[in-house]
């Protein structure tokens, strides 16, 4: 079907359009092109007749329009009257007639848009301002910036008059920003300049800098009043209610103890008619006093609190020194100084920051110290400990057990015996002890101050006979060549010899073993495979002996290079390929492979059943042992021959 | 890019026959008509006529008919101005030129010089 | 036949000048006028079309004008490069030229 497409739809004025035609018929007595949706003669463009090569213009024609042989028809120089539809009369070879219609929009390239404001100095709070994007122009989309960014969501913008239009309702200072509207058409697009919304507001509650109250007797006096305002607030200064002067600072040279007293800054804003004001209470010494230490948390709790200690009074123009533990100030990441060096604050306190502090004001002559002040930091309790270790005693002998655990305050303790409450004291005695007094001992540890308790529980056991002991591991499952093993035989005894078996034969002498905690830790260094054996410890005293069941230690090792079988590489045609790979690991590794590159099975045999030469290339098996996370290769080359062409060649499996 | 390449300069006697050719490229040959114009030794433009490229069928000014021969060779975007019977005032450079549809030339070629001398 | 009168046949200018040549036809041609740049050893280029509004390659100091049996064609701010023969053709089923004006400089 033959059918008009405009190159653009959308023309700009002044641009060009190409009326482009699709599917034109084949053996074509001519063409003419007609303004409008209709065949008409008075609105005729340009006509051509194929056989003539020549195209004649019609009533419509411009000069504008440029025909094509394929009958496309460029219009240059488009003009807003150009808009419309465009009829193309397509005449066959055998005078049978087509017509296509194709249409185009003209649009105004659009002017620089312009913004237009209904109020220049709005106030803070109180006014709206409505900003207006100008011209009005018809077909016209108008968009709204702010910094350069789109308009942010928020109840006190809207948008009206066809966006044409934007409104902040009850303006704040943070609205002094830069305004561009933007206006858009299909054809193009037009930012105006900037605006800078002028918002008065203020003034704020004027600040007074700086903000040390204490002064000695001599020093200058220079105070510093700042409001925000818009415009910039005027400031006047009173002391002790009376009027002063109309400046933002305030300089008092050499005071004396009589210009003690309080002062006020009062800013005023002429636009918004608003005034605030701020007092402070100055102080002269006569003399510098001496300094004392003061701190927002008397008992701070270990690893929780922060405590700020600050050197008063303040006074201007003074150095502030520290002390801690009669020393300088240690680098710390958890010490913090002021600016001015007044305030030290310790960041998350622990035990060890009880002091003594001691701050110091450096004046012309000397430095005055302050007391020094100790920390009570509140920690506790920890895990309790109870001694002696022993766990097996013999009956008749004294059980003597004792219980600490560091806290502040000291901790209070408690004893229980499976679970059975005994006494509240530090230490527990039992005379003359029986098998009866075997069981769970627990101390338990308080703190009053921080409300904390911590146990530690007791296994004895009060027995003539020795017990069958055990072993215990801190590693299960060790990695050759990296790993260690600590085994450690159990229990504790009083008075008792520890005995270590591998194999059934006492300890070898080897660099890799060692004894240590009184031969009740036997470590070895850098498993390696052999290591994994059967491992017995044993204990004896004056009246028995007894061994522990035997530990075999699993060494993870591997996978160690695999080897592919048969070693055959050359095989004949027709016969089937039969590899088997294995590699030494602990535990059993992954297989997998791959043929020229290319992954294969996940198996440790690889079948191909009749090989041809199509088979030759590499073939490679990987292993992988996920325990150790180590990984292995190797790589076999196999030749397949057709058949009877090479003597010696495998027939395969 | 349109370019009309004609080929070189020729010295003939009186009698003889020229054949010069204009060789298009650039756009479809068939479609736009391919005029021919001469300017004699400082004289002006002389159109001489056209061929339809889409037909075949020629076109000659009066002053032409006789002797002038248009032709095309469609396959080659080819086409071809020849002069039987060469005579002195047949001495002249020779223009191909495409017709615009609109009928006004477009492009030209370089010019074709042509001697006639005994 | 439609017969075209240029004048004049030759003409000096200066560099930076105007110049104006007419072409007279024997009867009204419509607009159908179209204005051609010579230069020796060269072929002719286009140097206006009446007809056409748009003329891309031509200098916008060349300018034409006329309609029935009078036609002018300008350049203004002459420049070396314009210095050529000029010549108007009448296009329609059959063609004319007019004498040609040949442009040197002062």
């Known amino acids: 079907k033959l059918t008009i497409e405009s190159t653009p739809f959308n023309v700009a004025e002044g641009k060009e359009v190409l009326l482009l035609v699709h599917n034109l018929p084949q053996h074509l007595f001519g063409y003419s092109w007609y303004k409008g949706e209709r065949v008409d003669g008075n609105r005729q463009i340009i006509g051509y007749v194929i056989g003539t090569q020549q195209a004649t213009p019609g009533p419509a024609y411009s000069g504008r329009e440029i025909i094509y042989p394929n009958a496309s028809l460029l219009i240059q120089n488009i003009i807003q009257n150009d808009t419309g539809f465009y009829t193309l009369h397509v005449i066959k070879s055998d005078l049978v007639n087509e017509e296509a219609t194709g249409q185009f929009r003209v649009y105004p390239e659009l002017p620089k848009p312009s913004i237009s404001s209904n109020n220049s100095k709005p106030v803070e709070d109180k006014d709206a301002v409505a900003f207006t994007c100008e011209p009005e122009t018809q077909d016209a989309t108008y968009l709204w910036w702010v910094n350069n960014q789109s308009l942010p969501v928020s109840p006190r913008l809207q948008l009206s008059n066809g966006n044409r239009t934007l409104t902040l309702f009850n303006v704040t200072r943070n609205d002094t920003a830069s305004y561009k509207c933007e206006t858009q058409n299909p054809v193009s697009a037009r930012r105006s300049d900037s605006v800078i919304l002028n918002v008065l507001y203020g003034p704020d509650a004027p600040t007074i800098s700086p903000l040390n109250t204490s002064y000695r007797s001599g020093e200058n006096l220079n105070l510093s009043c700042h409001a925000a305002s818009n415009p910039p607030a005027q400031y006047s200064w009173f002391v002790n209610g009376t009027f002063q002067q109309s400046t933002q600072e305030l300089f008092i040279p050499n005071i004396t103890v009589n210009n003690s007293g309080s002062y006020t800054c009062q800013a005023h804003n002429s636009d918004t008619g608003l005034n605030r004001t701020t007092v402070t209470t100055i102080t002269v010494y006569a003399e510098p006093p001496k300094p004392f230490i003061t701190s927002n948390n008397s008992n701070p709790v270990e690893d929780e609190d922060a405590v700020a200690l600050t050197c008063e009074p303040e006074i201007q123009n003074t150095t502030y020194l520290w002390w801690v533990n009669n020393q300088s100030l240690p680098v710390s990441p958890r010490l913090q100084l002021s600016n001015d060096n007044r305030t030290l604050t310790l960041l998350s306190v622990t035990r060890n920051d009880v002091g003594p502090y001691e701050c110091g004001i450096q004046n012309e002559l000397s430095v005055d110290h302050s007391d020094p002040v100790i920390l009570n930091v509140l920690y506790g309790p920890d895990d309790p400990t109870i001694s002696p270790s022993y766990t097996y005693y013999r009956p008749g002998v004294n059980l003597s057990l004792s219980c600490h655990a560091a806290s502040n305050p000291p901790a209070q303790y408690s004893w229980l015996i499976d679970g059975n409450i005994q006494q509240h004291t530090q230490e527990l005695f039992i005379s003359n002890i029986t098998e009866k007094n075997s069981g769970l001992y627990t101390c338990q540890a308080n703190n009053s101050a921080s409300g904390h308790s911590r146990t530690t529980v007791k296994t004895i056991t009060v027995s003539a006979e020795l017990p069958k002991p055990s072993i215990s591991s801190n590693n299960s499952k060790p990695v050759e060549d990296k790993d260690a093993v600590a085994f450690t035989c159990e229990p504790e005894a009083q008075n008792t010899t520890y005995l270590w078996w591998v194999n059934g034969q006492s300890l070898p002498v080897s660099p890799r073993l060692q004894l240590s905690n009184g031969n009740r830790t036997l470590t070895l260094f850098n498993v390696t495979r052999n290591d994994a054996r059967a491992y017995v410890c044993g204990i004896q005293n004056s009246v028995s002996a007894n061994r522990s069941d035997p530990v075999t230690l699993d060494v993870l090792y591997g996978p160690d290079t695999p080897i592919i079988s048969p070693p055959d590489s050359s095989y004949l045609s027709g016969a089937n390929l039969n590899l088997s790979c294995h590699s030494a690991s602990n535990p059993s590794p992954q297989y997998s492979w791959r043929i020229n590159g290319i992954p294969q099975q996940h198996t440790q045999v690889l079948f191909i059943a009749k090989i041809t030469p199509n088979n030759n290339g590499t073939y490679a098996c990987f292993v992988s042992n996920l325990a150790t996370g180590r990984n292995n290769s190797i790589v076999k080359s196999i030749t397949v021959s057709a058949s009877g062409t090479s003597p010696g060649l495998s027939a395969g499996a | 890019q349109v370019k009309l390449q004609q080929s070189g300069p020729e010295l003939k006697k009186p009698g003889e026959t020229v054949k010069i050719s204009c060789k298009a490229s650039g756009y479809t040959f068939t479609d736009y008509g391919m005029n021919w114009v001469k300017q004699a030794p400082g004289k002006g433009l002389k159109w001489m006529g056209w061929i339809n490229t889409y037909t075949g069928e020629p076109t000659y000014a009066d002053d032409f008919k006789g002797r002038f021969a248009f032709s095309l060779e469609t396959s080659a975007s080819t086409a071809y101005l020849q002069i039987n019977n060469l005579k002195n005032e047949d001495t002249a450079t020779y223009f191909c030129?495409?017709?615009?549809?609109?009928?006004?030339?477009?492009?030209w070629g370089q010019g074709t010089t042509v001697t006639v001398s005994s | 036949d439609i017969e075209l009168t240029q004048s004049p046949s030759s003409l000096s200018a200066s560099l930076g000048g105007k110049v104006t040549i007419t072409c007279k036809a024997s009867q009204d041609i419509n607009k159908y006028i179209a204005w051609y740049q010579h230069k020796p050893g060269k072929g002719p280029r286009s140097a206006h079309t009446?007809?056409?509004y748009i003329q891309p390659g031509i200098p916008s100091r060349f300018s034409g004008s006329g309609s029935g049996r009078d036609y002018s064609f300008s350049i203004s701010n002459l420049e070396p490069e314009d210095i050529a023969t000029y010549y108007c053709l009448h296009y329609d089923n059959l063609h004319t030229f007019g004498g040609g004006t040949k442009l040197e400089l002062k």
């Open positions: 009446l007809h056409i």
């Open positions: 030129a495409r017709k615009d549809l609109l009928r006004y030339f477009d492009y």
